[in-house]
Interface confidence: medium
Amino acid sequence: AGLKLMGAPVKLTVSQGQPVKLNCSVEGMEEPDIQWVKDGAVVQNLDQLYIPVSEQHWIGFLSLKSVERSDAGRYWCQVEDGGETEISQPVWLTLVPRGSSAHHHHHHHHSAWSHPQFEK
């Protein structure tokens, strides 16, 4: 499977209290079960959501409603394919104090799924 955390590898800087949505792209699998991992521990994420780009290309989401200090860290996504676990490159999520302006740096892809999406 081709596995890609959108915008990775990159450092994301987010204002404390803001929501963040990470997107993970999986190609070459019909029904990927995407797991999200933070600092080596699986993030339990019931009702995980997906968008089908095509039959063999899926986008999975990790939504954080309101990021706090405990959410800072290294995130990646992973899938099991043929008994092997494939992992994406990571994103480093860092925080700035509430009200500060956050600059989130990422690679410049021009598609709807180009980088971790931020929602107000």
């Epitope: 029904e31 079960d33 993030v43 339990q44 994420n45 019931l46 009702d47 995980q48 959501l49 997906y50 968008i51 089908p52 989401f61 939504s63 954080l64 409603k65 309101s66 706090e68 999406q117 929602e119």
Partner: antibody, heavy 125, light 108 residues
């Protein structure tokens, strides 16, 4: 049209085993999670557990862990809720619910939007 | 285990604003969802992700969330809004769901 068709259940005695089913149609079964929700007579909703899109992961609420088993058969688009040993306190309406899964865009209205009609499980000696 | 707390009942006159609250320690981090259940029927989702109204639900229904409290507001409650309302969210570690105890809304 999304439909969740639930099986019926006869009166069961305490200690009996039981499996109830929820057959999905009108959508691709493996695009969504299925959850189960209990409602005792005259009482509120209780989240029991859920099974992931491809059946590889199950979650259970603390009150239900070890007492029920959630499973699914992708080939028949059917989810199951199973008891090895029923108790009188299991008497309730049980709903299966399509939850999570696919989204058509940035917003996510699919959470718990499609409910089965419920299966009434009476347990009495 | 994690709990969401709702008032057992709320009463308003037709045309008044009804507010139903839901309190839970994880609500600063987890979204709230609101369901309406009329007698003898399966529940219906009205609000998701704290404040987003489901298509087809009247505009008088709105949701908000601040800190550990989520609120369902019905502006100009109608007699047909009489029902039980439940909030739903996830436990803080995200590995199980929880419904609040439910609030019976009476519009008289």
């Amino acid at each position: 049209e999304v439909q969740l068709v639930q099986s019926g259940a006869d009166v069961k005695k305490p200690g009996a085993s039981l499996t109830i089913s929820c057959q999905a149609s009108g959508y691709t079964f493996t695009d969504y999670w299925i959850s189960w929700v209990r409602q005792k007579p005259g009482k509120g909703l209780e989240w029991m557990g859920a099974i992931s899109r491809n059946g590889s992961t199950t979650y259970y609420g603390p009150s239900f862990q070890g007492h029920v088993t959630i499973s699914a058969d992708r080939s028949t688009a059917t989810a199951y809720l199973q008891w090895r040993s029923l108790e009188a306190s299991d008497t309730a309406m049980y709903y299966c619910v399509r939850s999570g899964g696919l989204t058509s865009g940035g917003t996510i209205p699919e959470y718990y939007q499609h409910w089965g009609p419920g299966t009434l499980v009476p347990v009495s000696s | 285990s994690y709990e969401l707390t709702q008032p057992p009942s709320v009463s308003v006159s037709p045309g008044q604003t009804a507010r139903i609250t839901c309190s839970g320690d994880a609500l600063p981090k987890k979204y709230a969802y609101w369901y309406q259940q009329k007698s003898g029927q399966a529940p219906v989702l009205v609000i998701y992700e704290d404040k987003k109204r489901v298509s087809g639900i009247p505009e008088r229904f709105s949701g908000s969330s601040s800190g550990t409290m989520a609120t369902l507001t019905i502006s100009g409650a109608q007699v047909e809004d009489e029902a039980d309302y439940y909030c739903y969210s996830l436990a803080v570690d995200g590995n199980y769901g929880v419904f609040g105890g439910g609030t019976k809304l009476t519009v008289l």
